[in-house]
Interface confidence: low
């Protein structure tokens, strides 16, 4: 007898038997059922990219044989049934028919059956060999794609505790960034307010320590001052002295000419010793009438007398003509000495003019005239420049021969305009020329394209506002 | 005395080129920012084009862009309005004006024009 | 561009009385304004500047007033010499003029 049977063993693989009389064949076959569905932490398809690519085509295959075992299977058992049936007719007929005596027939249609069979068996174990030759196959491959299999597995495990510790490593780098970010905002916040206790501290100290430059100046003078006294009394004693021992000596005393304790310029001061940078006080030539002005002792050699400073746009210098005459500002910082003043001091003997400029990239130029006077003021101050030499000076920025003196209420320029109002300023306009130091202060990033700035234009342009200028005179023959 | 007189206007054809000079006495030209201005005939006043003092900078007005040039010679004393592919609405008395102070727009002397007529 | 529109386009004034033209600005132009006056086959010739401020010369019966977008040219007293074509120009944002006052005589 034959029957096939198909079944699950206790490890899950589906397992075929076939049992034909008294042999018994069972195939099992490995499923791709045991493959990681995609809900586990490894695709599957990560896996079966690695594997053979004709596995597919040896399922179906084997499908297909399958299919023909079990048709085979069907017929044979159909032919034992046949088989059965017949025999029972014929045992029947036999019996019936015993006195016939046919038996040798019988035989010979057993043995037809029988040979049939026996070939029918032979054509299903040629089948079966070719199933388990398949099988075997099949087996093989799979084996090794389990082999592949785990080895991705592996693989994957090893790069999975790799990054699980990466990923540990990076939170922990992350908190430690996190508490540093911490702690540098706690020390700029600290940072920030010893800057602010310390700025106040400098401001106060640069309060103080203007004061006691100013006392030390004033110090400084009234002492050199009691020296050149005391020095001119004893020498007075001394003379008295010896008058008063000679036998031949004459009742007149000569008087000592009184020495100079007025200065007319920086220069004069720098001569009688007192060397620092700073305010002094300065009397007109010919008069008693005083006026501050600072003296520049470390620049070129010392004694310049300063007429003009710019700096910080601290101080309007859009001002009167009164207001130019007599001077403005602060000598400590942005000002202006006086036209009167410095008319009456250059007429007195020969000065140099030297104009310091910086702009706001850090860049310093100068200018130097070898021979500068002011004409009176019923000449508006008329500016005299010969002798141009300097850092900005191929050519004179302001015009030459010498314009008029010009403010917002007195407009001796030589343009149809009022230059001192456009450009702002009180100045030596042209028409309204190439310079104007006295013009409107702008701050950095603002300083372009201004027109009414603080200009040099031989030196930065038309439009460039600068950012700090000096103006200071001395004597040519100091 | 400070004067300007314009020269190289006269008639042309649409397409057509012309040079207009500007001859400029009685100041330092090298001081001053440089303009041309128009006016069509029975019209308003246009600004055309100047040019800084030193002539690195030019500025023109959109209708003239890529057609006409400014340009100055500042040791002969000269301004130069170079006009190519002139149409009719070109047409106009040009003069050549000095800015004020730094290019400020102001005009405080103007020649007497040049007329550029551009007819077929 | 900045277009500068003067008004009335015409004016007819008596010599001696007063003459008010204006102008007005399509944007502020702060007061960046400057008027020009132009008599028949000659070139124009600078008034005011700063919408106020007279260049030298220039008689005190002209005067400018205004800031922003409005702007007026006043004449306190026509003389003969002063009937012209008036223009108002800005040069605050490049420089455009506007298309002129003609003042002529009653």
């Known amino acids: 007898y034959s029957n096939f049977r198909k079944s699950v063993d206790s490890t899950g693989r589906r397992q075929y038997q076939v049992q034909n009389g008294p042999c018994s064949y069972t195939f099992l076959l490995p499923e791709t059922d045991s493959c990681r569905s995609s809900s586990s932490p490894y695709m599957s398809n990560a896996v079966q990219r690695d594997a053979p690519l004709d596995y597919d085509d040896s399922v179906q295959r084997l499908q297909v044989l399958e299919n023909i075992l079990e048709n085979n299977t069907q017929w044979l058992m159909k032919l034992e049934n046949y088989i059965q049936d017949n025999m029972k007719k014929e045992m029947v007929e036999i019996q019936q028919n015993v006195v016939q005596n046919q038996t040798a027939v019988m035989i010979e249609i057993g043995t037809s059956l029988l040979n049939q069979t026996a070939a029918q068996t032979r054509k299903l174990t040629d089948v079966e060999a070719q199933v388990l030759n398949q099988t075997t196959r099949l087996e093989l491959q799979l084996l090794q794609h389990s082999i592949s299999t785990n080895k991705l597995e592996k693989q994957i495990l090893d790069q999975t505790s790799e990054i699980n510790k990466l990923q540990n490593k990076n939170s922990f780098l992350e908190q430690k960034v996190l508490d540093m970010e911490g702690k540098h905002s706690e020390q700029l916040q600290s940072m920030k307010e010893q800057k602010d206790e310390l700025q106040v501290l400098v401001s106060k100290q640069s309060s103080v320590i203007d004061e006691l430059e100013k006392k030390l100046v004033t110090a400084t003078v009234n002492n050199s001052l009691l020296q050149k006294q005391q020095h001119d009394l004893m020498e007075t004693v001394n003379s008295l002295l010896t008058m008063m021992s000679s036998p031949n000596s004459k009742s007149s005393v000569a008087i000592r000419k009184e020495e100079q304790t007025t200065f007319r310029d920086c220069a004069e001061i720098f001569k009688s010793g007192l060397t620092t940078s700073g305010i002094y006080t300065l009397t007109f030539p010919n008069s008693t009438e005083e006026i501050k002005a600072y003296c520049d002792m470390e620049a070129g050699g010392g004694g310049w007398t300063i007429i003009q400073r710019r700096e910080d746009g601290s101080v309007d210098f859009q001002r009167t003509w009164k207001e130019y005459k007599v001077g403005f500002g602060n000598p400590s910082g942005e000002y202006w000495l006086g036209n009167e003043f410095v008319s009456q001091l250059t007429n007195q003997q020969r000065y140099v003019l030297k104009i310091h400029l910086k702009d706001w990239e850090g860049n310093e130029a100068y200018s130097l005239y070898e021979h500068f006077y002011l004409s009176s003021e019923e000449l508006n101050y008329r500016i005299h420049l010969t002798g141009l030499t300097g850092t900005a000076a191929k050519i004179s920025s302001i015009s030459q021969p010498g314009s008029d003196f010009s403010t917002k209420d007195s407009d001796n320029d030589k343009c149809i305009c009022k230059c001192s109002q456009m450009l702002s300023g009180g100045w030596w306009f042209d028409a309204c020329g190439p310079s104007n130091l006295n013009g409107q202060y702008y701050p950095q990033k603002q300083n372009t394209n201004k027109f009414n700035g603080i200009k040099w234009y031989y030196w930065k342009g038309s439009g460039y506002s600068l950012k700090a200028t000096t103006m200071m005179i001395r004597p040519a023959d100091f | 005395e400070v004067q300007m007189v314009e020269s190289g206007g006269g008639l042309v054809q649409p397409g057509g080129s012309l040079r207009l000079s500007c001859a400029a006495s009685g100041f330092t030209l090298r001081s001053y920012w440089m303009s041309w201005v128009r006016q069509a005939p029975g019209k308003g006043l246009e600004w055309v084009a100047n040019?800084?003092?030193?002539?690195?900078?030019?500025y023109h007005v959109d209708s003239v862009k890529g057609r006409f040039t400014i340009s100055r010679d500042n040791a002969e004393n000269s301004l130069f309005l170079q006009m190519s592919s002139l149409r009719a609405e070109d047409t106009a008395v040009y003069y050549c004006a000095r800015d004020m102070e730094a290019s400020a727009g102001l005009f405080d002397y103007w020649g007497q024009g040049t007329l550029v007529t551009v007819s077929s | 561009e900045i277009v500068m529109t003067q008004s009335p386009a015409t004016l007819s004034v008596s010599p001696g009385e007063r003459a008010i033209l204006s102008c007005r600005a399509s944007q502020s132009i702060s007061s960046n304004l400057a008027w020009y006056q132009q008599k028949p086959g000659q070139a124009p010739r600078l008034l005011i500047y700063?919408?106020?401020t007279r260049a030298t010369g220039i008689p005190a019966r002209f005067s400018g007033s205004g800031s922003g977008t409005e702007f007026t040219l006043t004449i306190s007293s026509l003389q003969s010499e002063d009937f012209a074509v008036y223009y108002c120009q800005q040069y605050n944002y490049w420089w455009t003029f506007g298309q002129g006052t003609k003042v002529e005589i009653k």
């Open positions: 040019i800084k003092e030193d002539g690195s900078e030019k």
């Open positions: 700063g919408a106020s």
